[in-house]
């Protein structure tokens, strides 16, 4: 019997031959645990893992800590990959974090960071980000140094209220910061004056929901 | 649905006074904090004064210190700004913005521009002779 061939994220697939998008299983090495995870390997030459994806509000993202920790959703539509997977993941080499966003008016754009990695979860999945480019704002709209992370049932941030609970979603926030890509999702001409909405302040302003975004992470110098 | 509306903008001489409203809609002041903004041609959005009407706290900006006083109504669900003394420099729009008030950091008074996530249309302020 051949030996079962593993991937870790969406690189390792793009680099076996595999360079069509789509749903494919990850494994960490020295692990049994699978994750569905979606592969684009067509943006900036491919192999990208996508860990957040927001398109059309079908699915819930006020969920549990548990349920960010496992992932939720599906990995062809709205779904979270999962904090746990990330975190080892993004800790065993160096990865980049690219988050594309789409706003009601036919405009994209994009924030490249060249080091991201969550912390474990005994440190609340903490997000650790450096090097900031891209289209969607010269300033990072997630709040620097990075925050632990929230969850409806985990409070974790620096307000004196509960941003995961006033916000909906599970997020890094600081008190409670200049986005959140899990908010509520709203329909177009219903986008704005949203105080829980998808928000990605240093592209978009306050208050307004955006159409789409997408969070994907690929080894550094891939 | 949230709304803001601003009005009592107009042409006002150096030395001046003007009353701004904010009507707000779709929420009540009692559970936000309304924050008056402004910004002149080719400059940033600055904070002028904020408001939370549950606590009766209010901020102003050392340039208008002595000089606005903000104020609310939580009957008419309105806030006002009363502008006294006006100086050319003065001449901006003007907007009203809201903030759920529990949306501070731990040991701070006030919040980021970021935080304010309703925002009205604005109404012009001009101060010239």
């Known amino acids: 019997k051949g030996e079962q061939i593993s991937f870790r994220d969406c690189a390792e697939v793009f680099k076996s031959g595999h360079t069509t998008n789509g749903v494919y299983t990850l494994t960490l090495p020295n692990s049994t645990e699978e994750v569905k995870a979606y592969c684009d390997m067509e943006a900036g030459g491919g192999g990208w893992t996508i860990i957040q994806r927001r398109e059309d509000g079908s699915v819930d993202f006020q969920r549990t800590w548990k349920e960010y920790k496992v992932g939720f959703g599906n990995p062809s539509g709205e779904y979270w990959l999962g904090n746990e997977f990330v975190s080892q993941l993004t800790n065993q080499q160096r990865y980049v974090l690219k988050i594309h966003l789409k706003d009601w008016e036919g405009n994209e754009a994009y924030s490249l960071y060249e080091h991201f990695y969550l912390s474990s979860e005994e440190l609340n999945y903490r997000i650790h980000l450096k090097g900031l480019t891209g289209t969607a704002g010269k300033i990072s709209s997630i709040s620097q140094p990075g925050n632990d992370f929230s969850t409806k049932d985990a409070d974790n941030d620096k307000c004196i209220c509960k941003c995961s609970q006033m916000l909906t979603g599970g997020w890094w926030f600081d008190a409670c910061g200049p986005s959140n890509l899990n908010g509520m999702y709203y329909p177009q001409r219903q986008n704005t004056n949203k105080f829980n909405g998808i928000k990605w302040y240093y592209w978009k302003g306050s208050g307004y929901s955006l159409k789409g975004t997408t969070m994907m992470i690929r080894p550094a110098g891939f | 649905e949230v709304q803001l509306v601003e009005s009592g903008g107009g042409l006002v001489q150096p030395g001046g006074s003007l009353r701004l409203s904010c009507a707000a809609s779709?929420?009540?002041?009692?559970?936000?904090?309304i924050g008056w903004f402004r910004q002149a041609p080719g400059k940033e959005r600055e904070g002028v004064s904020a408001i939370r009407s549950s606590g009766g706290s209010t901020y102003y900006a050392d340039s208008v210190k002595g000089r606005f006083t903000i104020s609310s109504d939580n009957s008419k669900n309105t806030v006002y700004l009363q502008m006294n003394s006006l100086r050319p420099e003065d001449t901006a729009v003007y907007y009203c913005?809201?903030?759920?008030?529990?949306?501070?950091?731990?040991?701070?008074?006030?919040?980021?521009?970021?935080?304010?996530?309703?925002w009205g249309q604005g109404t012009l302020v001009t101060v010239s002779s």
């Open positions: 779709g929420f009540t002041l009692d559970d936000y904090a």
């Open positions: 913005a809201a903030v759920p008030a529990g949306r501070l950091r731990f040991g701070e008074q006030w919040y980021p521009l970021y935080e304010y996530d309703a």
